[in-house]
């Protein structure tokens, strides 16, 4: 069966939401004049072929902009970017791409999101506001990688 | 540079098993998918099955499904291919190729040189 | 499990253009086969030329291009070099699985 984009949005536990500003996902307050990103995810298709356990593999678009987050390496260290893709090719390809998914993990209302081409490292958004999303492997410290998700329909 | 390098020709017995191997170096393969891929005389190319060496799991062409194990040693970054019960059908030259996502798809990128296994009484 | 078939032979002039493809007996091909070309000249190697259907692996030639093409997927070589005299193999994706084609001979002479 071929899924379709879950539209959802996101705000950590801080009540920020993520808002797009020159190609880079801030996190800022929710205000009256903040448009936040719209985020669409679908599940990868095979499955089976990733690790158990570790949440559900999917991938994270920006609703109705060709914009998908993946993650890089610059340097030594994983960076989280956003790449210009479809999510529905990055769904329909014959393998998953390790580098555009992320194991999506629920804990009553909190999700987190893991790398799956760096296991280990979380979407995460620093303490303070208005800054870049980032990567981090420090869980609950200066960073926040708990998020809600609400589905939008 | 990045290179695949398998290991020598094998003579074996039917009903034997053998183990290739395919050393990689130039890339770490935790990154990408390995594949082994056979060529028996005179014929077209047969995929067997991919292994994913970060996590370890396994597709198989149903044809090679309880014939062909895929495993990796990651501290090596090795991958073999095991064949069991060989028959003379299975005589062929055995490829491994790394397939990668460059950009916009997934590609053969690199081969290895291949092994030639011959099964003979 | 699909079939797949390629032209066993086919000859192309130095500077000319030829088309290989790759049928499905399962009927039409399309983008969701992904299909995929390689190359594998005399006493060398196999080489990725394409992904994807249409996507140049990095570091291959403009002069080869994949397409679909009346139902199969093609690989057109512009402007062909003699050395790329060898053999030509397709694959296609089937859900999980992948089937080679018998490969194309394809002499420049």
């Known amino acids: 069966k071929s899924e379709m984009p879950q539209p959802v949005s996101i705000q950590d536990i801080n009540h920020r939401v993520w808002v797009l500003q020159d190609q880079i996902l801030i996190a800022v307050p929710r205000k009256d004049r903040v448009s936040p990103v719209t985020i669409s995810l679908i599940s990868c298709r095979h499955v089976e072929t990733l690790e158990k356990d570790r949440g559900n593999p999917i991938y994270l678009g920006l609703n109705g902009l060709n914009l998908c987050l993946m993650c890089a390496k610059a340097g030594d260290q994983p960076t989280l970017q956003l790449k210009e893709k479809d999510i529905m090719d990055l769904y329909n390809q014959p393998e998953p791409v390790k580098s555009f998914l992320f194991y999506h993990s629920q804990s009553g209302r909190n999700s987190t999101f893991e790398s799956v081409a760096f296991p280990g490292w979380f979407i995460a958004v620093s303490s303070e506001g208005g800054c870049p999303l980032i990567l981090t492997q420090e869980l609950g410290k200066a960073n926040t990688t708990d998020f809600g998700l609400t589905m939008l329909f | 540079q990045v290179q695949l390098v398998q290991s020598g020709a094998e003579v074996k017995k039917p009903g034997a098993s053998v183990k290739v191997s395919c050393k990689a170096s130039?890339?770490?393969?935790?990154?990408?998918?390995i594949y082994w891929v056979r060529q028996a005389p005179g014929q077209g190319l047969e995929w067997i099955g991919r292994?994913?060496?970060?996590?370890?799991?396994?597709r198989y062409d149903p044809k090679f499904q309880g014939k062909a194990t895929l495993t990796t040693d990651t501290s090596t970054n090795t991958a073999y291919l095991e064949l069991s019960s060989l028959r003379s059908e299975d005589t062929a030259v055995y490829y491994c190729?790394?397939?990668?996502?460059?950009?916009?798809?997934?590609?053969?990128?690199?081969w290895g040189q291949g092994t030639l296994v011959t099964v003979s009484s | 499990q699909a079939v797949v078939t390629q032209e066993p032979s086919l000859t192309v002039s130095p500077g000319g253009t030829v088309t290989l493809t790759c049928r499905s007996s399962?009927?039409?091909?399309?983008?969701?086969?992904?299909a995929n070309w390689v190359q594998q000249k005399p006493g060398q190697a196999f080489t990725g030329l394409i992904g994807?259907?249409?996507d140049r692996a990095p570091g291959v030639p403009a002069r080869f291009s994949g397409s679909l093409l009346g139902g199969k997927a093609a690989l057109t070589i512009s402007g062909a070099q003699p050395e790329d005299e060898a053999d030509y193999f397709c694959?296609?994706?089937?859900?999980?699985?992948?089937?080679f084609g018998g490969g194309t001979k394809l002499t420049v002479l």
């Open positions: 190729a790394r397939y990668d996502y460059s950009g916009s798809s997934f590609y053969f990128d690199y």
């Open positions: 399962t009927g039409a091909v399309t983008t969701s086969n992904y």
């Open positions: 694959a296609l994706w089937y859900s999980n699985h992948l089937v």
């Open positions: 292994i994913d060496p970060a996590i370890g799991t396994t």
């Open positions: 994807g259907t249409n």
């Open positions: 130039g890339f770490n393969i935790k990154d990408t998918y």
